[in-house]
């Protein structure tokens, strides 16, 4: 399970190889409190992957989920 | 360390299939890829699949497509690589390849590097008639 | 065809800097993937030598250093060494819907002259 303070789940590194997009249902940010700003996209199998927020492929998979 | 150990040298008829093994000792968890990457004599490397535990995924590249199938035994410690309708064109040697996909929230001490970082020793495959 | 272009070749004087270029598009590079580059000595398998554009694993010398902007990413040597005549080639991903793709460059022979 995640580890958290505050139960908000926090990532110290970050996915660099991008994961199909088919297999990515949701996306939540980490709280403003964790030390690094990062995405949690969550597959289909609902396992939860960090990811860089200010890679542009990750705001492109942010915005086709919005879209979705 | 991690250690992938492939099977032996094949040599093929133009036409027939090949399969070949990739055993990861301790097992290949779901934090990982698993990639074949061949390599032609004298030629560079090329990327042809890889096995994706993490969304139990398979993909292929576009030029293997229905040629190629890689697939894992029910352990999760070898993968395989068959490829079919071989031609003398696909002499080479064959590679597997590891490669951290998951990094999840919460502490990462157990956190290699990212990219292909484990790899298999290489198998040649000659295909000759 | 590669998708990553690298040249062909290069050659450096032992204790010189050679740098090693490698250029994508929009679709790769230029979407923010990261680049990774890797050594192949001759007879042997290829050996990860940086990772995530700039970042070196435990073992490899600080003489080799990467780079990356936009489109294209760069590996640098400095103070060249016998032992660094080999094949390089940088690596990087192309991703769809249903696809993660690794791609590689065409690879760069280092000669030591």
């Known amino acids: 399970s995640p580890y958290s303070s505050d139960t908000t789940p926090c990532c110290f590194a970050y996915i660099a190889r991008p994961l199909p997009r088919a297999h990515i249902k949701e996306y939540f940010y980490t709280s403003g409190k964790c030390s690094n700003p990062a995405v949690v996209f969550v597959t289909r199998k609902n396992r939860q992957v960090c990811a860089n927020p200010e890679k542009k492929w990750v705001r492109e998979y942010i915005n086709s989920l919005e879209m979705s | 360390q991690v250690q992938l150990v492939q099977s032996g040298a094949e040599v093929k008829k133009p036409g027939s299939s090949v399969k070949v093994s990739c055993k990861a000792s301790?097992?290949?968890?779901?934090?990982?890829?698993l990639s074949w990457v061949r390599q032609a004599p004298g030629q560079g490397l090329e990327w042809m699949g890889g096995?994706?535990?993490?969304?139990?995924?398979?993909n292929y590249a576009q030029r293997f497509q229905g040629r190629l199938t890689i697939t894992a035994d029910d352990s999760m410690s070898t993968v395989y690589m068959e490829l079919r309708s071989l031609r003398s064109d696909d002499t080479a040697m064959y590679y597997c390849?590891?490669?951290?996909?998951?990094?999840?929230?919460?502490?990462?001490?157990?956190?290699?590097?990212?990219?292909?970082?484990?790899w298999g020793q290489g198998t040649m495959v000659t295909v000759s008639s | 065809q590669s998708v990553l272009t690298q040249p062909s070749s290069v050659s450096g004087a032992p204790g010189h800097r050679v740098t090693i270029s490698c250029t994508g598009s929009?679709?790769?590079?230029?979407?923010?993937?990261?680049v990774h580059w890797y050594q192949q000595l001759p007879g042997s398998a290829p050996k990860l030598l940086i990772y995530?554009?700039?970042i070196r694993p435990s073992g490899v010398p600080a003489r080799f250093s990467g780079s990356k902007s936009g489109t294209s990413a760069s590996l640098a040597i400095t103070g060249l060494q016998a032992e660094d005549e080999a094949d390089y080639y940088c690596?990087?991903?192309?991703?769809?819907?249903?696809?993660?793709?690794?791609?590689f460059g065409g690879g760069t022979k280092l000669t030591v002259l």
């Open positions: 390849a590891r490669e951290q996909v998951a990094v999840g929230p919460g502490p990462t001490s157990d956190r290699g590097p990212d990219g292909l970082d484990v």
């Open positions: 301790g097992g290949i968890s779901d934090n990982y890829a």
């Open positions: 096995f994706i535990p993490l969304v139990d995924t398979t």
């Open positions: 929009n679709s790769n590079l230029g979407a923010d993937y990261d």
């Open positions: 995530d554009n700039n």
């Open positions: 690596q990087s991903y192309d991703t769809g819907l249903t696809s993660s793709d690794v791609i």
